[in-house]
């Protein structure tokens, strides 16, 4: 059974992941982003189901495409270095989902824009955090 300290650690990691995802979304989904129109043409795979930490496998598999799109975003409004940012997210995701069990991600039929993709994973983080608090 999870201890209170491990639950607290999980919660903090999820909050960190949530902040990173929100910051990416804020940097992209605004009218001052000169590359927004182009960035919205890229398609991302969405999880068929995302209710448990193991489903973060679906996010992990889309981090490389996410980094490629973020490389377009360098501007006055996007000060984060995509490689560092994605690396940080990857570390958190690996810790959260664990590496003991292998989970095969199932994707939804419909692809999504980067904004829809980020919003989906933000909602996932908020949902899991709410069950922990």
């Amino acid at each position: 059974a999870p201890t209170s300290s491990s639950t607290k650690k999980t919660q903090l990691q999820l909050e960190h992941l949530l902040l990173d995802l929100q910051m990416i979304l804020n940097g992209i989904n605004n009218y001052k982003n000169p590359k927004l129109t182009r960035m919205l043409t890229f398609k991302f795979y969405m999880p068929k189901k995302a209710t448990e930490l193991k489903h973060l496998q679906c996010l992990e598999e889309e981090l490389k495409p996410l980094e490629e799109v973020l490389n377009l975003a360098q501007s006055k409004n996007f000060h984060l270095r995509p490689r560092d940012l994605i690396s940080n997210i990857n570390v958190i995701v690996l810790e959260l989902k664990g590496s003991e069990t292998t989970f095969m991600c199932e994707y939804a039929d419909e692809t999504a824009t980067i904004v829809e993709f980020l919003n989906r994973w933000i909602t996932f983080c908020q949902s899991i955090i709410s069950t922990l608090t």
């Epitope: 902040l19 929100q22 940097g27 605004n30 009218y31 996007f78």
Partner: antibody, heavy 122, light 111 residues
Framework: QVQLVESGGGVVQPGRSLRLSCAAS????????MHWVRQAPGKGLEWVAV????????YYADSVKGRFTISRDNSKNTLYLQMHSLRAEDTAVYYC???????????????WGQGTTVTVSS | DIVMTQTPLSSPVTLGQPASISCRSS???????????LSWLHQRPGQPPRLLIY???NRFSGVPDRFSGSGAGTDFTLKISRVEAEDVGVYFC????????FGQGTKVEIK
Amino acid sequence: QVQLVESGGGVVQPGRSLRLSCAASGFTFSSYGMHWVRQAPGKGLEWVAVIWYDGSNEYYADSVKGRFTISRDNSKNTLYLQMHSLRAEDTAVYYCAREEWFGEADYGMDVWGQGTTVTVSS
Amino acid sequence: DIVMTQTPLSSPVTLGQPASISCRSSQNLVQSDGNTYLSWLHQRPGQPPRLLIYKISNRFSGVPDRFSGSGAGTDFTLKISRVEAEDVGVYFCMQTTQFPTFGQGTKVEIK
């Protein structure tokens, strides 16, 4: 002094069109992004559209997408909002507002016009 | 869209007394450049909105120092240290971190 003056409002039937104008003076119009924001009678503020300082990008609220077009003529220091297929729910005071987002201060929407009233009614 | 929620919606105040308005956003408003694009606007009856505060706590030029803004992340506050007659009207919080959205407005009136 810095000023934005809207015009073009009026009473129009549902389904018809209208074009609003916003005349700018007292500042370098071509350095500023421009917004349209509306306010239905007795209600709050709703963002409608934005256009980049050079006209290169424009974005719209979902409620007006495909019906409204924002444009500008920097040589005339004028912003426009072309409105088609008007609905009763478009009835509002329409304000233009400026925003400089490549300056150091990042004030946001720091200057607003007095507004022009659009009434959509049969 | 980011949803902005203001409380209270109405605030009867006594002249010379303080007033406070809260604004909560549905998402963190920190932009990737480190700034938080949260503004406060004031609208008197029959007038257009007027910018009071930008980037959480910066007073716009000409705004009296009785107005102050604070907060971070998702929770923000506008305070008027001593309400004057000219302060009546509706106050809106607004975010431009993503596409602009406004709070519902808080009506400040004199008791």
